[in-house]
Interface confidence: low
């Protein structure tokens, strides 16, 4: 239904606290360099304006769209061109082109320092002095670094952050309480960021239909007792919600997400037997809980998939009369039977089934032609299963750090032109798949591994798209979203690459490495490893092990030395010479 004032409508639906949080996220995702203080001023102005519209929907400007109101606010910022260059050109455009222009200027890799967590005492002091401002800073810092973060979910993580601080800041050992809990929130939030970026990429590159297919498969796995019509309704709603968030319509997105949660809780009987615990929670937790819900039990009496999709004499007629519906039903029926498959795999199977019907239904004897289609799925299923098996075995053998290094070598060989920081980030994230997925029960491994890898590879594609340097990466990134992971897996050493010259300074280290946290130390070592591979793309595993082992010993020795600087200065050149020799 239409509202006189959209901003008043959203303010009333969301409530002041969530409204302000979402407006702050929106501004932080659009103007990623602005300081918190500048954004919070705009948020307050927008909130005050929304309140005047709630009091009187006919008040001046209350009938304007939210894009118009937000865009006008952003464009009124002084020195916009000085700070944002080209983005200021967007302000010359009218809506909806202006918003499109803002979206195109979102930077997936903004030049911002890594978010440093203050030490425990300082954190607790500022949290207790002003919790609202403290959590506002959290929203701002995360949103500006992740301009596609799913806004209602970010509000949920801020709530979690709040809970952790409320609990831990009363403890005697604040750091011991805070560190593991905040690490867990951070890890979940980072995974959520890459997953949502993948959804926005899917929407941007392949449109709503592709996202809806993803949603149908996912919902069918989770809710195998729901009817196809119900799954279609949920998938359609979820597509609309994600389109809004990816498009910067954060207030509408959060409002619609809450509506969907309400609908699901009011219709549990036709959706899933597992929803009740989620439905007892407050709105943000309810939506998050529903998004993470465990799969319902598969109905016991499901007939073979072959009955309707292979053996039925009307297959081609059904397909011809309503292609999308027939394929949607196939995806639904296959997915609800296979919670043990990744969504990417299910979509590849549906694509294979569609291609088979396209070919066979045009031939003289269609049933004879498509009769073997289910058997033809076998290699498509085996490929990711083998990937999971070999990678989880490697992870179990090497541990997370060693596994990351193995992936780093592999990916540097596949795409040596890609910048070292990007390769290190990708390998570290890809390597986390072991810790995240390989410890799960067998039936959950494949969906966990493949769907997580797909999201991380999407991040690699997004970064590469900004400055394309590798034809192979461009090829894998340009194809269909569901074929990306197999495409990257199939890449081999890039034979066209001319090895980098050996530069001694790349492998020269100083005593500052000794005081770095473990994570930063690892990144330094992995940076050196990637550079080694770029210098010697065909180095054997043993050669690399020797050099990296030597390097680790060198760092260890010099960090224990009485005169660290002297040790690094004298031992460093020896290490470089030995490394060159080992790789010759």
């Amino acid at each position: 239904e239409a509202h006189k004032s959209e901003i008043a409508h959203r303010f009333k639906d969301l409530g002041e606290q969530h409204f302000k949080g979402l407006v702050l996220i929106a501004f932080s995702q659009y103007l990623q360099k602005c300081p918190y203080e500048e954004h919070i001023k705009l948020v307050q102005e927008v909130t005050d304006f929304a309140k005047t519209c709630v009091a009187d929907e006919n008040a001046e400007n209350c009938d304007k769209s939210i894009h118009t109101l937000f865009g006008d606010k952003l464009c009124a910022i002084p020195k916009l061109r000085d700070n944002y260059g080209e983005l200021a050109d967007c302000c010359a455009k009218q809506e909806p082109e202006r918003n499109e222009c803002f979206l195109q200027h979102k930077d997936d890799n903004p030049n911002l320092p890594p978010f440093q967590r203050p030490e425990a005492e300082a954190m607790c002091t500022s949290f207790q002095e002003n919790p609202t401002s403290f959590l506002g800073h959290y929203l701002h810092e995360v949103a500006r670094r992740h301009p596609y973060f799913y806004a209602p979910e970010l509000l949920y993580y801020a709530e979690k952050y709040n809970e952790v601080l409320t609990q831990c800041c009363t403890e005697s050992d604040k750091a011991a309480c805070l560190t593991p809990k905040l690490d867990a929130v951070k890890e979940k939030a980072l995974v959520a960021a890459v997953r949502q970026r993948m959804k926005c990429s899917s929407m941007q590159r392949f449109g709503e239909r592709a996202f809806k297919a993803w949603a149908v498969a996912r919902m069918s796995q989770r809710f195998p007792n729901a009817e196809f019509a119900e799954i279609t309704k949920l998938a359609t709603d979820l597509t609309k919600i994600n389109k809004e968030c990816c498009h910067g319509d954060l207030l509408e997105c959060a409002d619609d997400r809450a509506e969907l949660a309400k609908y699901m809780c009011e219709n549990q009987a036709t959706i899933s037997s597992k929803l009740q615990a989620c439905c007892d929670k407050p709105v943000l937790q309810k939506s998050q809980c529903l998004a993470e819900i465990e799969h319902d039990n598969i109905p016991a009496d499901l007939p073979s998939i072959a009955a309707d999709f292979v053996e039925d004499k009307e297959v081609c007629k059904n397909y011809a009369e309503a292609k999308d519906v027939f394929l949607g039903t196939f995806l639904y029926e296959y997915s609800r039977r296979h919670p043990d498959y990744s969504v990417s795999l299910l979509l590849r199977l549906a694509k294979k089934y569609e291609a088979t019907l396209e070919k066979c239904c045009a031939e003289g004897d269609p049933p004879a032609c498509y009769g073997t289609v289910l058997a033809e799925f076998q290699p498509l299923v085996e490929e990711p299963k083998n990937l999971v098996k070999t990678n989880c075995e490697l992870y179990e053998k090497l541990g997370e750090y060693g596994f990351q290094n193995a992936i780093l070598v592999r990916y540097t060989q596949k795409a040596p032109q890609v910048s070292t920081p990007t390769l290190v980030e990708a390998a570290r994230n890809l390597g986390r798949v072991g810790t995240k997925c390989c410890t799960l029960p067998e039936a959950q491994r494949l969906p966990c591994v493949e769907d997580y890898l797909s999201a991380i590879l999407n991040r690699l594609c997004v970064l590469h798209e900004k400055t394309p340097v590798s034809e192979k990466v461009t090829k894998c990134c340009s194809g269909s979203l569901v074929e990306r992971r197999p495409c990257f897996s199939a890449l081999t050493v890039d034979e066209t690459y001319v090895p980098k010259e050996f530069k001694a300074e790349t492998f020269t280290f100083h005593s500052d490495i000794c005081t770095l946290p473990d994570k930063e130390k690892q990144i330094k070592k992995q940076t050196a490893l990637a550079e080694l591979v770029k210098h010697k793309p065909k180095a054997t595993e043993d050669q690399l092990k020797t050099v990296m082992g030597d390097f680790a010993q060198f760092v260890d020795k010099c960090c224990k030395a009485a005169d660290k600087d002297n040790c690094f200065a004298t031992e460093g050149p020896n290490l470089v010479a030995r490394s060159k020799e080992a790789l010759a």
Epitope: E227, F228, E230, T232, T270, D308, V325, F326, G328, T329
Partner: nanobody, 123 residues
């Protein structure tokens, strides 16, 4: 052989009510979404309401929302259409239809059709 047999049509005054029934045979009723369509003289056939195979999901055309209610009894292989506050523009031949695969419920997705039952709203 699949058969859909409608009943319950007739003449009624504006503001009155009717209950249409559709009895199905020759198909696994609980595997089919069911719908009611109508065709007024000289007009295209239009979808009025439909209900998914378990009854958990329904669709109503805007023109009948709040006045018509669809329901089904899978144990009796029957679908019902309760029509209240009838108007002269509801006058039409009402068809019952069954769909094996139903998402949007447009006409071409329905596989089996009944012969229709006539509803006339007139004072």
């Amino acid at each position: 052989e699949v058969q859909l047999v409608e009943s319950g049509g007739g003449v009624v005054q504006p503001g009155g009510s009717l209950r249409l029934s559709c009895a199905a045979s020759g198909l696994t009723f609980s595997s089919y979404a069911m719908g009611w369509f109508r065709q007024a003289p000289g007009k295209e056939r239009e979808r009025v309401v439909s209900i998914s195979r378990g009854g958990g999901y329904t669709y109503y055309a805007d023109s009948v929302k709040g006045r018509f209610t669809i329901s089904r009894d899978n144990s009796e292989n029957t679908v019902y259409l309760q029509m209240n506050s009838l108007r002269p523009e509801d006058t039409a031949l009402y068809y019952c239809a069954a769909a094996r695969y139903w998402a949007t419920g447009s006409e071409y997705e329905f596989d089996y059709w009944g012969q229709g039952t006539l509803v006339t709203v007139s004072s």
